[in-house]
């Protein structure tokens, strides 16, 4: 721990009525917990690659930053935060890379100031539903979250639930309605397949949504309408084949949008014509310069905004007696 | 060990300003806030500020705003105080003192500058 | 601001004898933002007792802290030579920190 435990002041006669003495003056007790370094001036405690196997209970009541990454937590049990007096500063909370595989409901309570969580890199199993809301009621206490970071927090195939994985996060976004006031959610490098099809109409504060290094196919359930104050939309790097008119009508009624398409393996067939023409027209898509096709094989590495409707054809649907094998 | 510095004590005139300095050392000085106390001959200890070396945030008690600027060079590890507009009700000794929020107490001294205002 | 009165200003006291001074805040403060300092002659203030109750390492065992809310007490339970000085509190409820007038304590 940081603070120092030596102890000495000098005071001199530089004051012409105080006599030379050595002051031996006892330092206070360091409020530093174990295998962690802590900042009073940057309010902040870090206890980083410590293999703690749970969250100190002798935190200061003034951290406002506690990194907690590269750890071995595996549980955050309810109240994992809870403290008396409470860590009524704490703001930013870094839990990446310490091999967290379930958070229980409730983990994140008493944490009134709490405003950018961070749980990337952890093998979530088992998310509970009421894990950012606290309580299982249908609406519930409004949660002071503005950032939520979760980004590959997916567990390996075998060790996944009986369940939808994105179905798990979703119920953690939704619970309670409590993260109404979220502005930036990072869920990227989880192997999304779809997004189910509430999330985002729930979340009406978004800023920031960053869904890259997913497997995204489709967006045709996704609504963006209510999305109001969205700024910048992460798709890079899915499996997006082509963005369809009603999702490109929303994406351009968004008024502060930029959107990143960059790494799909675009299909440029006829139903790209659409978007083939959005592109041309539309600011919101940053480097849009550099999307290419990635299907039909002929297509291959073309620029999309190179290409005319001519180049956009679908092969004619044989009637079965046609088809060769 | 923990050590605060202060510089030699001054003999001003009526309004002029002094600046006296605080070197600290044997702990990470921007790790700290650090505090300066006002000591009147026979008079209680006058809290008058606190700099967060960090952020650079200053916190002035209202009775001081005015009177005391303080300063830090981080490259030094060195805190400044200036009293500008001096009277013979500003004499007396200043300390810094570092501040330690866990408990908003102070914990390490330094050993006073002497600051007498005479014409 | 959260003024503290300390009485008495001064007390003299007997070798061996209890003595109690106390401090008293116009607000009510934290147990664990109320703090003593003991500060002899010439010397800069040492913190003596901090959250109210707990002893700065090498304080000797005789003194003793208590109080809650707005009012709170040093205690020494037998009183030495080397306790003469002068003792402060200061509290922290929100800035400005504040502190007390002061007790000299005497031996007699």
């Known amino acids: 721990s940081s603070s120092p435990t030596s102890s000495a002041s000098s005071f001199s006669s530089s004051a012409p009525f105080l006599a030379s003495a050595v002051s031996a003056q006892p330092p206070l007790p360091d409020q530093c917990p174990a295998l962690c370094e802590c900042s009073e001036a940057a309010r902040t405690v870090k206890c980083v690659n410590r293999n703690l196997t749970e969250v100190p209970t002798d935190l200061p009541a003034y951290v406002r930053n506690l990194f907690l990454t590269g750890n071995q937590l595996a549980v955050l049990p309810a109240g994992a935060f809870a403290r008396r007096p409470p860590l009524a500063e704490l703001a930013a909370l870094n839990l990446s890379g310490s091999r967290l595989d379930e958070v229980r409901a409730g983990a994140f309570e008493h944490l009134p100031s709490l405003r950018q969580l961070d749980l990337s890199h952890n093998p979530l199993a088992d998310l509970s539903p009421f894990a950012f809301s606290g309580s299982n009621a249908s609406v519930s206490a409004p949660s002071p979250l503005v950032e939520l970071i979760l980004n590959h927090i997916v567990p390996p195939e075998d060790e996944r639930q009986n369940r939808s994985f994105e179905g798990m996060v979703v119920a953690a976004l939704l619970a309670g309605r409590a993260l109404q006031g979220l502005r930036r959610l990072e869920l990227a490098s989880n192997h999304f397949l779809y997004l189910p099809r509430d999330v985002l109409a729930q979340l009406p504060s978004l800023r920031h949504l960053d869904l890259s290094n997913n497997s995204l196919v489709s967006l045709t359930y996704v609504s963006f309408r209510n999305l109001t104050h969205l700024e910048s939309l992460h798709l890079e790097d899915n499996a997006l084949k082509v963005l369809h008119n009603g999702t490109l009508a929303e994406l351009q009624g968004l008024p502060h949008i930029r959107v990143f398409l960059d790494n799909n393996p675009w299909v440029c067939d006829c139903h790209m014509a659409d978007m083939v023409t959005w592109l041309k027209e539309t600011e919101v898509v940053q480097g849009k310069d550099r999307l290419t096709c990635a299907y039909p094989e002929k297509m291959r590495n073309r620029v999309l905004l190179e290409l005319n409707s001519a180049d956009l054809d679908c092969d004619p649907i044989l009637p079965p007696s046609l088809q060769t094998s | 060990e923990v050590q605060l510095q202060q510089s030699g004590p001054v003999l001003v005139k009526p309004g002029a300003s002094v600046k006296m300095s605080c070197e600290a050392s044997?702990?990470?000085?921007?790790?700290?806030?650090m505090s300066w106390v006002k000591q009147s001959r026979g008079r209680s200890l006058e809290w008058i500020g606190v700099?967060?070396?960090?952020?650079?945030?200053?916190i002035y008690n209202q009775k001081f705003k005015g009177k005391a600027t303080l300063t830090v060079d981080k490259s030094s590890s060195t805190a400044y105080m200036e009293l500008s507009s001096l009277t013979s009700e500003d004499s007396g000794v200043y300390s810094c003192?570092?501040?330690?929020?866990?408990?908003?107490?102070?914990?390490?001294w330094g050993q006073g500058t002497s600051v007498a205002v005479s014409s | 601001e959260n003024v503290l009165t300390q009485s008495p200003a001064i007390m003299s006291a007997s070798p061996g004898e209890k003595v109690t001074m106390t401090c008293r805040a116009t607000s009510s403060v934290s147990s664990g933002h109320f703090h003593w300092y003991q500060q002899k002659s010439g010397a800069s203030p040492k913190v003596w007792i901090y959250s109210t109750s707990n002893l700065a390492s090498g304080v000797p065992a005789r003194f003793s802290g208590s109080g809650s809310g707005t009012s709170f007490s040093l205690t020494i339970s037998s009183v030495e030579a080397e306790d003469v000085a002068t003792y402060f509190c200061?509290?922290?409820?929100?800035?400005?920190?504040?502190f007390g007038g002061g007790t000299k304590l005497e031996i007699k």
């Open positions: 700099f967060n070396p960090y952020s650079g945030e200053i």
């Open positions: 200061q509290q922290y409820s929100g800035y400005p920190l504040t």
């Open positions: 044997g702990y990470s000085f921007i790790d700290y806030y």
């Open positions: 003192a570092r501040l330690r929020i866990s408990y908003y107490a102070i914990d390490y």
